[in-house]
């Protein structure tokens, strides 16, 4: 109430940029906090199927839009066939997870590995067996699976037949795929993520063309894709809520990614307004319909009225509240390359704590899972990844401050990534794994990097001890 009254910002995220120490929820003087995370804090690590599985056409797997994009757009990348070969070396991934001591493993299911042309008929038996074995192995080791249904690898057949996410036909097809996954894996999965970072799917897939399917320049298509992604997520949430939650007793969300931004002039109301607009145009675009009032943010509706689809009153009601927690991604993919339109002439910042505070203020202090966090190193760096440790310490310190000092309800943290792998438009030029993989080797040994030992220690101590 005080925040609303004093700042005049009606309790929204703009209060974050107020540098008056009486109002700002972020205490900048607290540079590092030696403390532990809450008891039973959920420590995990993640991967994306396309990034690590390899075997892009093995055992009946169908091609994805990314397999196609690699062959047509990323000329100096042969394919993801090499990668870390998790499809072949599942046991090696499990021993790495076992070693690091995580509470959960977040991975994605490759839609075309289960259904080669995307349509739910009879599942590809080898694909089904792979994910079933992975889940069983995790359960045996008391590692909770967090399963993402869509991490960008749309079956190519759906792109070619329907135009992919531009076509609202895909909403029902995605729901069928989700239903199958709930039926087959829901006995072992208590946490589901529908879509990983839909902002990047829409913006880079259909705006800049930097991601598959590589379409560019059509702003109407960008927002149509975003609209269909939100509706697909919502449909799946309602499906799970009605038909599966009663007996499977799980939770479901969508991972939303964002950058953070600081005003050029901290006292300047216009710069603060631009920062708010920047966050709204990236995170608010998807968070507002799902975690907010069921509609797009007002600023977006006004500014993009000619290209932004409209939610009917019934749809708004349907979208609102379709997430059981706020799954948040904060990593390099939302920073490089940053949408210059979203920057609005302000300064990007890696302040995760402030981003979490913004979410708290905008969306009524939800329970938050950091669903992806970490940085990257150059591909030449092998196991001595000191930069990655520095960044991890920094990020984790910010999360801990957010929990302890700002009373933000972060309940889990996903280090990204378990393994070095295929890094989208950066292909194999950067590494994000806590385990080093020589992509040219036959056995693809997972070698623990310094960051793996560091994260393992953090998990063991549940934070930072003096």
């Amino acid at each position: 109430i005080l925040l609303r009254a004093v700042t005049g910002f009606s309790g929204d995220g703009r209060a974050i940029w107020s540098k008056n120490p009486n109002f700002t929820p972020v205490n900048e003087s607290q540079l590092f906090l030696y403390d532990t995370f809450p008891k039973n804090f959920f420590w995990g690590i993640g991967t994306g199927a396309l990034q690590v599985e390899g075997s892009w056409k093995k055992d009946g797997k169908g091609p994805s839009i990314w397999d196609h994009f690699i062959h047509t757009h990323l000329k100096n990348v042969s394919s993801t066939n090499g990668s870390s070969d998790s499809y072949i070396f599942l046991e090696k991934d499990l021993s790495a997870l076992d070693f690091i001591g995580v509470s959960f493993y977040q991975f994605s299911i490759s839609w075309p590995r289960l259904f080669p042309d995307g349509i739910v008929t009879v599942a590809n038996a080898k694909g089904l067996q792979y994910y079933s074995t992975l889940l069983d192995a995790l359960v045996l080791r008391n590692i909770e699976p967090i399963v993402t249904l869509y991490h960008w690898d749309l079956p190519l057949a759906l792109q070619e037949k329907y135009g992919g996410w531009k076509n609202d036909t895909i909403i029902d097809i995605f729901n069928d795929y989700a239903t199958y996954c709930f039926q087959m894996f829901g006995d072992r999965v208590k946490y589901w993520i529908t879509i990983h970072n839909p902002y990047l799917v829409a913006w880079h897939g259909y705006g800049t063309g930097m991601h598959a399917p590589g379409e560019k320049g059509n702003l109407a298509a960008v927002y149509t894709v975003g609209h269909n992604l939100i509706k697909a997520h919502s449909k799946v949430w309602h499906n799970y809520n009605t038909h599966f939650r009663p007996h499977q007793k799980g939770w479901l969300s969508i991972t939303l990614g964002s950058h953070w931004i600081e005003p050029n002039r901290s006292e300047n109301t216009m710069d603060i307004f631009k920062c708010q607009q920047s966050m709204v145009s990236v995170l608010g675009w998807f968070a507002n319909p799902i975690h907010g009032d069921g509609d797009y943010p007002e600023g977006m509706r006004k500014k993009l009225f000619s290209v932004l689809p409209i939610f009917s009153e019934a749809e708004k009601h349907e979208m609102r509240g379709t997430a059981d927690f706020f799954a948040f991604s904060f990593g390099p993919n939302n920073f490089k390359p940053l949408n210059t339109m979203a920057k609005m002439g302000q300064n990007v910042s890696l302040n995760l704590r402030e981003a979490l505070n913004w979410i708290k203020l905008e969306y009524n202090n939800p329970r938050i899972l950091i669903a992806e966090n970490g940085w990257f190193t150059d591909s030449r760096v092998k196991t001595e990844d000191t930069t990655a440790i520095y960044m991890m310490k920094n990020f984790l310190s910010q999360v801990l401050q957010a929990i302890r000092l700002d009373e933000i309800r972060v309940f889990g943290y996903t280090a990204w990534s378990l393994l070095d792998g295929f890094e989208w438009q950066d292909a194999y030029t950067i590494r994000r794994g806590l385990f080093y993989v020589d992509f040219n080797s036959k056995q693809k040994e997972r070698k623990p990097k310094s960051s793996a030992h560091y994260y393992k220690q953090i998990i063991r101590e549940n934070g930072f001890s003096l």
Epitope: F89, K92, S95, G101, Q443, E445, K447, P448, R460
Partner: antibody, heavy 120, light 107 residues
Framework: EVQLQQSGAELLKPGASVRLSCTAS????????THWVRQRPEQGLEWIGR????????KYDPKFQGKAKILADTSSNTAYLQLIGLTSEDTAVYYC?????????????WGQGTSVTVSS | DIQMTQSSSYLSVSLGGRVTITCKAS??????LAWYQQKPGNAPRLLIS???NLETGIPSRFSGSGSGKDYTLTITSLQTEDVATYYC?????????FGSGTKLEIK
């Protein structure tokens, strides 16, 4: 070159305790799991348990619980197997074994074995 | 615990012959199986992991196959240096368990 060097043979009386050592060279034991395996005379292999030397976490076959304790000292790159309340049934060769972590669970590096004889 | 059964304790085979050693798990182990060779007075040597992946430096006459509960180690052309005891081991779940071993002799 990767090697696991085990301590020498032991001749012990019933009721005694013993600590066997396994020192790694060519790799850091903190980077993987160390297993211990028993082989009684003219018998097969039995998995005793394993340790994660970087944090001391252990897992045992329940039948060895209370009989065997696995420890590690990272400063000397050494894993230990402590056996208590020895009886003639514990007469066996004890092997330590390991594997480059990133290659899974099967054991590709083995020590030469330590012979333990329990006799009155 | 998962029981591993090697039905043949002894196998007598001619030099140059083909040998098949079987191993049955009491539960599904999803190919998480290793084969070891042990010669008298020596430590075991890992031949195959993941039911069928030949370890570095192991001759190609050794191969592994199987799925679910049933697994096989095959030696295509038996050499004198292959005379040893062979053990299977599952590592799907702890406690990791070994089969009782199959001793190979020359006929």
């Amino acid at each position: 070159e990767v090697q696991l060097q085990q301590s020498g043979a032991e001749l012990l009386k019933p009721g005694a305790s013993v600590r066997l050592s396994c020192t790694a060279s060519g790799f850091n034991i903190q980077d993987t799991f160390t297993h211990w395996v028993r082989q009684r005379p003219e018998q097969g292999l039995e998995w005793i348990g394993r340790i994660d030397p970087s944090n001391g976490n252990t897992k045992y076959d329940p039948k060895f619980q209370g009989k065997a304790k696995i420890l590690a000292d990272t400063s000397s790159n050494t894993a230990y197997l402590q056996l208590i309340g020895l009886t003639s049934e514990d007469t066996a060769v004890y092997y330590c074994a390991s594997r480059a972590l990133g290659n899974g669970y099967a054991m590709d590096y083995w020590g030469q074995g330590t012979s333990v004889t329990v006799s009155s | 615990d998962i029981q591993m059964t090697q039905s043949s304790s002894y196998l007598s085979v001619s030099l140059g012959g083909r040998v098949t050693i079987t191993c049955k798990a009491s539960d599904h182990i999803n190919n998480w199986l290793a084969w070891y060779q042990q010669k008298p007075g020596n430590a075991p040597r890992l031949l195959i992991s993941g039911a069928s992946n030949l370890e570095t430096g192991i001759p190609s006459r050794f191969s592994g196959s199987g799925s679910g509960k049933d697994y096989t180690l095959t030696i295509t052309s038996l050499q004198t240096e292959d005379v040893a005891t062979y053990y299977c081991q599952q590592y799907w779940n702890t406690p990791f368990t070994f089969g009782s071993g199959t001793k190979l002799e020359i006929k």
